[in-house]
Interface confidence: low
Amino acid sequence: YHGCPSECTCSRASQVECTGARIVAVPTPLPWNAMSLQILNTHITELNESPFLNISALIALRIEKNELSRITPGAFRNLGSLRYLSLANNKLQVLPIGLFQGLDSLESLLLSSNQLLQIQPAHFSQCSNLKELQLHGNHLEYIPDGAFDHLVGLTKLNLGKNSLTHISPRVFQHLGNLQVLRLYENRLTDIPMGTFDGLVNLQELALQQNQIGLLSPGLFHNNHNLQRLYLSNNHISQLPPSVFMQLPQLNRLTLFGNSLKELSPGIFGPMPNLRELWLYDNHISSLPDNVFSNLRQLQVLILSRNQISFISPGAFNGLTELRELSLHTNALQDLDGNVFRMLANLQNISLQNNRLRQLPGNIFANVNGLMAIQLQNNQLENLPLGIFDHLGKLCELRLYDNPWRCDSDILPLRNWLLLNQPRLGTDTVPVCFSPANVRGQSLIIINVNVAVPSVHVPEVPSYPETPWYPDTPSYPDTTSVSSTTELTSPVEDYTDLTTIQVTDDRSVWGMTQAQSG
């Protein structure tokens, strides 16, 4: 194969791979017809002048996971056909000016996971055809104006996992073709207005795991093609009324792990493609009417682990396609009977770990497709007659860890539970809290006459088959999808991003996996 170095393997497809700790310099002679060269996991510490001079047909060069700390400016001379160059996972602290000069065909440049302290406009001024630039996992503290001005064709730029404390509003102004911009895991405290104005083709913007406290009102005003916006794990305490008003293509928005205290109506401006909205781990205390009314296609809404104590009756107006609603671990004491009335397609509702004392009889009146209801760990003493009777698809109902009052009034519920025991699961069953003489006994098998001996209680066979709710209109039957979406924590959908880990101690939270939002 035109002379393959002994420490490398060469394939008929002109691919050369050189690996191993014994390699301390670029092996020679390399096959002149090599089109792909990989130098991986070696002890090479530097690249000298023109080590690749004789392989001018090279298209892809990967020099990764080495001890590389020094490169001379002419190291890549004569590689005019090179399209892909990776120097990732080395120990580079500085890049010589002119290092990429002559790489006129270069489209992908990977410099991630090094120790780069700075970049300068001159570093990339020759790379006019570059489409992808990976700089994540370095020690960059600042990006100077002009650093990317010559990269007008760039479509993907990753600056995540650096030490950036601020961004100039002009640094991205010439990147009109950029589709993906990642700034996650930096130390950004605010983003200047206008920073993203030039990014008219941007589809993904990753700003999660920074220290952003405030979003400028028109920050995303010009990014009409944005599809994925990651703002989770920041310090955002409020959302300007118009901040999301110009994002009609958005289909993924993460805001979990911030300090949001309130959501104003209309804050989520028309987003016809948004399917999931993650708002857990904030400080939201109430939900006003119509707060989500523009999100007509929303299927998953996660509001768990907030401080919600009040939900206005019209808070969920417009969410006709919602399948999953997570409200667990909040401070809810009561709910309006109409609060879920618009959620005709709801399949799964998590209300565990609240302070609910009672539920209105019509609370689930129009939600005929409900398959799972989590009510454990509340303050419920009883439930209204017939509350679940119309829920023909209900297959999971969690009622344990409530202070059930096992007097004569509990009989209808007990009898319904007897007939529907499989729906309660086998892990934990609801037990009586009062009266004291039956405390701790299973609600399902308790003899109410023993619990309250002085009261004669007629046996009630079950809840009525067709419940009548005096103050409630009758709702038409709705068809609902029978499969439930698994609610796991949102994983940002690209590989070079650290996944958010959600604490999943089900014994503490009382959650099934489907509710661990």
Epitope: M193, G194, V200, S216, P217, G218, H224, Q246, P248, P272
Partner: antibody, heavy 116, light 107 residues
Amino acid sequence: QVQLQESGPGLVKPSETLSLTCTVSGASINIYYWSWIREASGKGLEWIGYVHHSGGTNYNPSLKSRVSISVDTSKNQFSLRLKSVTAADTAVYYCARDTYGPFDYWGQGTLVTVSS
Amino acid sequence: EIVLTQSPSSLSASVGDRVTITCRASQGISNYLAWYQQKPGKVPKLLIYAASTLQSGVPSRFSGSGSGTDFTLTVSSLQPEDVATYYCQNYYSAPWTFGQGTKVEIK
């Protein structure tokens, strides 16, 4: 009450630069965007571009090479400069408040004629 | 850029008539559409935004509807003071663009 008032010369020579200023009263220029729109005779309305108090701008691509819009927050003003004008740039020029799209307050408009 | 096409270009109707103007976008713009009224020699005035939301102070005889590519402005009962040119405007995608206008006159 929000008011906008355009000012600047009504006559500009061909190839010269058209300069207009819009003074905003009754509202802070530090909120929303601020746009210029023009109406040529019989041609309908054409958006020229907007500016934000930070200096961020967005221009109509058809005019981008000739236009610049700037803001002076201390004076609550924003300005339009259009280079290399021709007779086709003769129009009534309006400034307007851009509430992230819709224009809810407009200036009275100023007619600019390009003629030698 | 998004092109907005209004129809008709002009119309004449009697006082009290129901008048309808349509605006078609060259691509879907959700409900990011506004309507303006411009009386002769006057400044354009915002009537409706978000396709159907009436701007404060605008008479209730004006209404808007539509989403995606097809939009409608309706005047339920035409009044003499409604003589004007009406424009639709896209604010879904920059550059903001206007329709060519519909001139409304009284018979």
